[in-house]
């Protein structure tokens, strides 16, 4: 089919963060076509030679392939024809990070988008009461973080308290030895009073919170990718 | 100021070899491919050879296919290329280039190469 | 294997625009990115994935692709845009065109 050397389409990328051993999600969305076959779907990498992944004709062309995402790789196919040319990532490696461009070909046009891709590890952590010490402690664990991250304890009562002195955090090494177990210990907990462990790095900030009052213990936790833009 | 510098180059004769450098500053050396590509006297461009960022993934024009080794040692920011059996046709400036996803960004000002006996 | 070809001269004068082409076989679904040599010097990128300007390079220079045929265009033509041009694609490896020499009359 011909393309007009005047026309551009627009294909837009969202930036995100890859939870190293998972799957992960690269964003890429453009002006869709009437017709499968008339789509071309080009995902490249920055320092790499072969494609990341190619669709073309309604079907994956893979004979380009770089051998780093053999086995990895897949588009949403059923989506392509409504502008969706998001690749789906298996088994996130760290060494995934990066530049990647989305580049498209239908026949109204071409048109590509870069994004960057972090990769890392990030996990809920868990708050709770350490019955086992010897005055009131909490102790927040993650079980999966990397690069290292900074821990920050934070209470409702005392708001703008520096905790740092009677806290103590610790990073343990998983067996594949990438990642680390986040274990924080907070001291002289007060009862009738709201706590909140903060894990964050480059990649992901995570809150734990946990309020305890006499009659019970409440907890919350959520997780929030950081640099995720458009 | 993202540069790069070629050395190595020389008169060598047929069948010898020679080792070209080529000296990277001003990026992240080990995030971005590089590329050789030869340019004989008076011809046009002819791409020789490119390596991926991390230095796993290579390509090969069919000329230098066997003949050619490309080779990066990102700890030093430097580009090889190590030449063997080298030909006559092989006469020419050698430069090396950043690749940027299709195409190449930044050029070396080139090393010259002479097969001569 | 992939080729490209280019007419090897183009003549123009001081202030009108010139057109050089570059032709492959459905070159239109390729990125096509234009290189400027002049005499003792190392190629400069001029114009990348078929229309854009790197920074620094003037706007008088332009690129379009279509079908079989990708063109650089050079408006309000300057005695220093007297060079060699080559346009490139990836298959594989780069290939390069045959090469364009620009007289500025």
């Known amino acids: 089919f011909g393309i007009s050397g005047r026309h551009s389409i627009t294909v837009t990328t969202v930036a995100s963060a890859g939870n190293i051993g998972e799957d992960g999600i690269l964003s890429c969305t453009f002006e869709p076509d009437i017709k499968l076959s008339d789509i071309v779907i080009q995902w490249l990498k920055e320092g790499v030679l072969g494609l990341v992944h190619e669709f073309k004709e309604g079907k994956d062309e893979l004979s380009e392939q770089d051998e780093m995402f053999r086995g990895r790789t897949a588009v949403f196919a059923d989506q392509v024809i409504v502008g969706n040319a998001s690749l789906r990532l298996k088994n996130v490696q760290l060494t995934d990070a990066g530049t990647y461009k989305c580049y498209i070909i239908t026949s109204k046009g071409k048109g590509n988008a870069n994004l960057e891709y972090k990769t890392g590890a990030f996990s809920m952590p868990e708050v709770n009461v350490d019955y086992n010490a010897s005055s009131e402690t909490l102790r927040c664990e993650a079980p999966r973080w990397f690069p290292q991250p900074t821990v920050v304890w934070a209470s409702q009562v005392d708001q703008g308290a520096n905790f740092s002195e009677v806290s103590n955090t610790s990073f343990e090494l998983n067996s594949e030895n990438v990642t680390m177990k986040v274990v924080s210990v907070l001291y002289n907990v007060t009862i009738n009073n709201t706590y909140s462990c903060m894990i964050e790095n480059d990649i992901a900030k995570a809150t734990g919170d946990i309020k305890v009052t006499e009659s019970e213990i409440k907890r919350r936790s959520h997780l929030q990718l950081l640099n995720s833009k458009a | 100021e993202v540069q790069l510098v070629e050395s190595g180059g020389g008169v060598v004769q047929p069948g010898r070899s020679l080792r070209l450098s080529c000296a990277a500053s001003?990026?992240?050396?080990?995030?971005?491919?590089m590329n050789w590509v030869r340019q004989a006297p008076g011809k046009g461009l002819e791409w020789v050879s490119a390596?991926?960022?991390?230095?796993?993934?290579?390509y090969y024009a069919d000329s230098v296919k066997g003949r050619f080794t490309i080779s990066r040692d990102n700890s030093k920011n430097t580009l090889y290329l190590q030449m063997n059996s080298l030909r006559a046709e092989d006469t020419a400036v050698y430069y090396c280039?950043?690749?940027?996803?299709?195409?190449?960004?930044?050029w070396g000002q080139g090393t010259t190469v002479t097969v001569s006996s | 294997s992939y080729e490209l070809t280019q007419p090897p001269s183009v003549s123009v004068a001081p202030g009108k625009t010139a057109r050089i082409t570059c032709g492959g076989n459905?070159?239109?679904?390729?990125?096509v990115h234009w290189y400027q040599q002049k005499p003792g010097q190392a190629p400069v990128l001029v114009v990348y994935?078929?229309?854009d300007r790197p920074s620094g390079i003037p706007e008088r220079f332009s690129g379009s692709n279509s079908g079989n045929t990708a063109t650089l265009t050079i408006s309000r033509v300057e005695a220093g845009d007297e060079a060699d041009y080559y346009c490139?694609?990836?298959?594989?490896?780069?290939?390069f065109g045959t090469g364009t020499k620009l007289t500025v009359l």
């Open positions: 390596i991926s960022g991390s230095g796993s993934g290579t």
């Open positions: 001003g990026f992240t050396f080990g995030d971005r491919a």
């Open positions: 490139q694609v990836w298959d594989r490896g780069m290939i």
């Open positions: 994935d078929d229309s």
């Open positions: 459905n070159i239109g679904m390729k990125s």
């Open positions: 280039a950043r690749k940027r996803w299709y195409g190449m960004d930044v």
